[in-house]
């Protein structure tokens, strides 16, 4: 819901966005995701920090945990045990990497209104979770896994070999956290809490990245992280399952790796419990075009896990890597053997398939020149999923329901016509058995969250509509946004253009390209945002464009896999092509064109600046990759193969930023990096800077001491202020 355009007489009461607005988060929005605890109940933290239980059917709500109790231990998070007898309270949050953090945990007994005393949890804990039934606890402390039958009981130590930076039990190492699991945990309870599965990562042989953390002491600390760069030794992973009732009986039992996977380097990619005695593991060859899904069963007689070859399902890509960004995970149906999964169909579009016996005999559930993106829930009679089918806009997300109980299955778009102008990009959150669900709309209008009946899809209530934000934006001159496409040489390039409020096609405007462009990414999305580029358009009169070129997602494998084994070529070409098309539109000042990007976007912006086209006057690279030999094995090799002579070393060498140092001579380049970047190491920018100095090319640079890949806190303000000055100077805009 964008504030509507006003008449000129009112225009003088409207103001442009300021940089301060952006840095203060003045126009940030809220979403409402219910914390479902049953088919019809959810928990939510109220504005005054009470934890409230809502019952949709009775309409009643009551506080299960007061803000006073939360405050007594400075809790920033909570978790209710499934039997509703205990709540864990999380405090002393200490961030580690993207998902991981440590914290102190207190257990509050709801039956007597007291904290559990005796056998308190150690601190700091790396991960803690309740069993899905009852109130067993599993937690990771100092890289070892512990089990508690109940919060007040002494713990049972499951693993003993955990060692910092060497052996990780129940939590991922750096590369598995960032590039494979995308979680802080690597343990999984079976549905009724009978078994606990966990991963052990052995990083003993992985080379270590070391960087200085300056802090405030006389001597800097050295941070050491086992981090496999492309071609390096990888972690060795093993999966174990332990019976939580009799953990000492046979101890942890290792789940066998499929023979075709174990024959060379491999990864574990995910674990899905099917029943208490059936588990599904997914494995991936190091050359990530072959994935194996293995269904394993518990053998009571031997107390072991059996993974018959007949229950191995192979997914292979002949045109690229397996899956999208990750290999998709299965959603099992009620028979506990067949499942639904998203993978490429014969036309090269990712779609939902139903697998009953073999992948070859899979039944395709969705089809078309669009993609199914996520399967939310499968019930006895319905399958809920999201896709970008509606009106052929790849940057939209709508929620669909397919009736699987009837034949032929009927499809209904749940969201397409709800708030058509305001809401075109949805996600959903379902209660048990999909009795109810919440829809969270991210835009293009002001985000709104609503509650719906799972049977009728009827809207029950608005959970969050961001009224204050709507009111705050009433006197703001927001930029105009349009999403359109360019057709170039049989390639469709979708773009989003952000235009100044009083945009006039007959005038000339400076153009800023914002690029990410990484494999399986999408920048052109129908979502709401008031951010730095909104300010640049609103206040500084720039046109900003985002372009999804080759390598980006949700438009079919042809576009996605075009960059396979040759990163840094087509992504850059497509940005350049789009700029040329924008110039042809007549309102771009071709002497004032800039490009900027962060991370992969910093790599692309650097290569675009060094393309020798003369199109760009200036550009910014924030925390860029500069050579694929410097980045993580799991990510890099997925798209590039190995940096060996007999594989793809030549393109690794050809695709560096350093190799193009000479070409920066005719552009203004601002290079920015955090010195404590655990992800894209400062090494990347250090090597760019060295190459530019060696080529005697002038450039600007900014480092952020002790900052990681996110450049957060005060660094954020400094960063955006600095980049604003740089762009205004480049575009000859007065300060």
């Amino acid at each position: 819901l964008r504030p509507s355009r006003v008449h000129n007489s009112e225009e003088n009461t409207m103001r442009a966005l300021t940089l301060k607005d952006i840095l203060n988060g003045t126009f940030s929005y809220k979403t409402f995701f219910p914390n479902w605890i049953s088919g019809q109940e959810y928990l939510h933290q109220s504005a005054d920090n009470n934890i409230v239980l809502y019952n949709i059917e009775t309409g009643q709500s009551y506080t299960i945990l007061s803000n006073r109790t939360m405050k007594s231990v400075n809790a920033s998070n909570y978790g209710l045990s499934p039997d509703r007898q205990f709540v864990y309270l999380e405090s002393d949050y200490s961030k580690l990497w993207r998902y991981s953090y440590t914290a102190t945990y207190y257990i509050y007994d709801l039956s007597n209104g007291e904290f559990v005393r005796g056998n308190e949890l150690p601190r700091p804990i790396q991960y803690l979770c309740w069993s899905p039934v009852g109130s067993k606890l599993a937690y990771v402390y100092q890289n070892n896994i512990y089990l508690k039958q109940r919060p007040g009981d002494p713990p049972f130590q499951i693993t003993f070999n955990g060692r910092e930076n060497k052996i990780f039990n129940g939590i991922p190492d750096w590369v598995y956290e960032e590039e494979m699991l995308a979680t802080k945990y690597a343990l999984w309870w079976s549905p009724n809490g009978k078994f606990l599965a966990y991963a052990e990562f052995n990083d003993t042989d992985i080379p270590v990245i070391a960087y200085s953390y300056y802090g405030d002491e006389q001597y800097p600390r050295t941070i050491n992280i086992p981090y496999p760069k492309a071609g390096a030794k990888n972690p060795v992973v093993r999966i174990f399952i332990i019976d939580t009732t009799y953990p000492a009986y046979v101890g942890p039992q290792e789940v066998p790796v499929p023979a075709m996977i174990a024959s060379s380097d491999y990864y574990f990619s995910w674990l899905t419990w099917v029943t208490d005695e059936r588990v599904c593991l997914q494995w991936l060859k190091r050359v990530q075009n072959v994935s194996v899904l293995s269904i394993c069963d518990f053998r009571e007689d031997w107390q072991t896990w059996d993974c018959p070859k007949t229950q191995e399902h192979i997914e292979e890509s002949r045109t690229g890597w397996a899956g999208g960004f990750f290999v998709s995970t299965p959603v099992f149906s009620y028979d506990a053997i067949s499942y639904y999964k998203i993978f490429s169909d014969k036309d090269g579009y990712k779609h939902i398939h139903y697998i009953k016996d073999t992948v070859e005999n899979a039944i395709q559930i969705t089809s078309g020149k669009w993609e199914a993106i996520n399967i939310f829930r499968v019930t006895q009679d319905s399958l809920f999923y999201s896709s970008n089918e509606f009106e052929e806009y790849p940057g939209r997300r709508n929620i669909y329901r397919i009736s699987i109980g009837s034949y032929p299955p009927s499809k209904k778009c749940v969201t397409c016509h709800l708030r058509k102008e305001r809401c075109q990009y949805y996600t959903a959150s379902f209660s048990d058995y999909a009795k109810y669900y919440a829809l969270v709309c991210y835009g293009p209008g002001i985000p709104i969250s609503t509650l719906h009946d799972g049977r009728t899809d009827q809207e029950i209530k608005i959970l969050e509509e961001n009224k204050e934000l709507e009111n705050a934006l009433k006197n703001i001159q927001l930029p105009k946004e349009e999403i359109k496409k360019l057709e170039v040489d049989e390639i469709t390039l979708w773009y989003k253009m952000i235009l100044p409020p009083q945009f006039d096609r007959s005038k000339k405007y400076p153009l800023l390209i914002q690029v990410y462009g990484g494999p399986c990414s999408q920048s052109v999305r129908s979502v709401f945002a008031v951010n730095w580029i909104s300010y640049l358009a609103s206040k500084e009169g720039m046109v900003i464009a985002l372009v999804d070129g080759r390598g980006t997602a949700f438009q079919g494998d042809k576009l996605l896999y075009a960059v396979y084994r040759k990163l840094g070529v087509y992504e850059v070409e497509d940005q350049i092509t789009a700029v040329r098309k924008f110039i042809e539109m007549g309102f771009i000042d071709e002497k004032r064109i800039a490009i900027w990007g962060w991370s992969y976007g910093g790599y692309v912006s650097s290569l675009a600046l060094a393309s020798g086209t003369g199109l760009f006057k200036c550009g910014i690279a924030v925390a860029p990759v500069s050579s694929w030999e410097y980045y993580a094995s799991v990510y890099t090799e997925r798209f590039m193969g190995l940096p060996t002579k007999d594989d793809n070393l030549e393109h690794y060498k050809n695709s560096t930023v350093m190799a193009r140092a000479e070409y920066f001579r005719n552009v203004d380049y601002l290079l920015i990096h955090g010195t404590a970047d655990d992800n894209v190491h400062f090494q990347n920018s250090a090597q760019i800077a060295k190459a530019l100095v060696n080529a005697q090319v002038d450039f600007q640079a900014m480092w952020y001491s002790d900052q990681n890949h996110g450049l957060s806190g005060l660094s954020t303000n400094h960063l955006y202020t600095h980049m604003t000055h740089f762009l205004k100077q480049c575009f000859s805009l007065s300060d």
């Epitope: 007898q85 009852g134 109130s135 067993k136 089990l147 039958q149 109940r150 009981d153 002494p154 049972f156 130590q157 003993f160 009732t245 009799y246 953990p247 000492a248 009986y249 101890g251």
Partner: antibody, heavy 118, light 107 residues
Framework: EVQLVESGGGLVQPGGSLRLSCAAS????????MSWVRQAPGKGLEWVSW????????GYADSVKGRFTISRDNSKNTLYLQMNSLRAEDTAVYYC???????????WGQGTLVTVSS | DIQMTQSPSSLSASVGDRVTITCRAS??????LNWYQQKPGKAPKLLIY???SLQSGVPSRFSGSGSGTDFTLTISSLQPEDFATYYC?????????FGQGTKVEIK
């Protein structure tokens, strides 16, 4: 506070039967493995039997296998030991104990004396 | 079955003494070894679980160590209330077995 209270002990003739009970309170009984341990007069401790939380799995010492049956009623928070074909060597104080993780006995009852004698 | 052998079977010590009791398993039991204290006419009481973890409420003068087959219970400074019989117990294979006991008497 965890409490385990045994009852049902007494004097019984060889070949006779006896049923011991153990009333549990102060914890979620249905969530734990429960066990019986005995101690003959002036002797050491001997484990007798255990039963899984839901009651579907049991274990017995060789010395009582086939004669003793362990059971539980989770709705009544009670553990039982049915002792048949009793022998003189079964004379002991019988303790009800919680067998945490199937590994250690963290709470014990006060015991009930069973005397098998003619 | 796994046999547990405790030594000594009895010992005499004075208040303030450091007392060590050992327990040997007939095969490796990892760290699944527990120690109990029993006073005459009373039920046993858990002191140490998992070889070295102190049960809640047990004084810190009690400590346990070892893994595999050899284990030790140490009382760093014997107190009057510590005169009792001590039992080790293995919990490896759902067939718990106890040592024969060590009686700690006043010298």
């Amino acid at each position: 506070e965890v409490q385990l209270v045994e009852s049902g002990g007494g004097l019984v003739q060889p070949g006779g039967s006896l049923r011991l009970s153990c009333a549990a309170s102060g914890f979620t009984f249905r969530g734990y493995i429960m066990s019986w341990v005995r101690q003959a007069p002036g002797k050491g401790l001997e484990w007798v039997s255990w039963i899984s939380p839901e009651g579907s799995r049991t274990g017995y010492a060789d010395s009582v296998k086939g004669r003793f049956t362990i059971s539980r009623d989770n709705s009544k928070n009670t553990l039982y030991l049915q002792m048949n074909s009793l022998r003189a060597e079964d004379t002991a104080v019988y303790y009800c104990a919680r067998l945490l993780y199937g590994t250690w006995f963290d709470y014990w009852g006060q015991g009930t004396l069973v005397t098998v004698s003619s | 079955d796994i046999q547990m052998t405790q030594s000594p079977s009895s010992l005499s010590a004075s208040v303030g003494d450091r007392v060590t009791i050992t327990c040997r398993a007939s095969q490796s039991i990892s760290s699944y070894l527990n120690w109990y204290q029993q006073k005459p006419g009373k039920a046993p009481k858990l002191l140490i679980y998992a070889a070295s973890s102190l049960q809640s409420g047990v004084p810190s003068r009690f400590s346990g160590s070892g893994s595999g087959t050899d284990f030790t219970l140490t009382i760093s400074s014997l107190q009057p209330e510590d005169f009792a019989t001590y039992y080790c117990q293995q919990g490896r294979l759902l067939l718990p077995t106890f040592g024969q006991g060590t009686k700690v008497e006043i010298k």
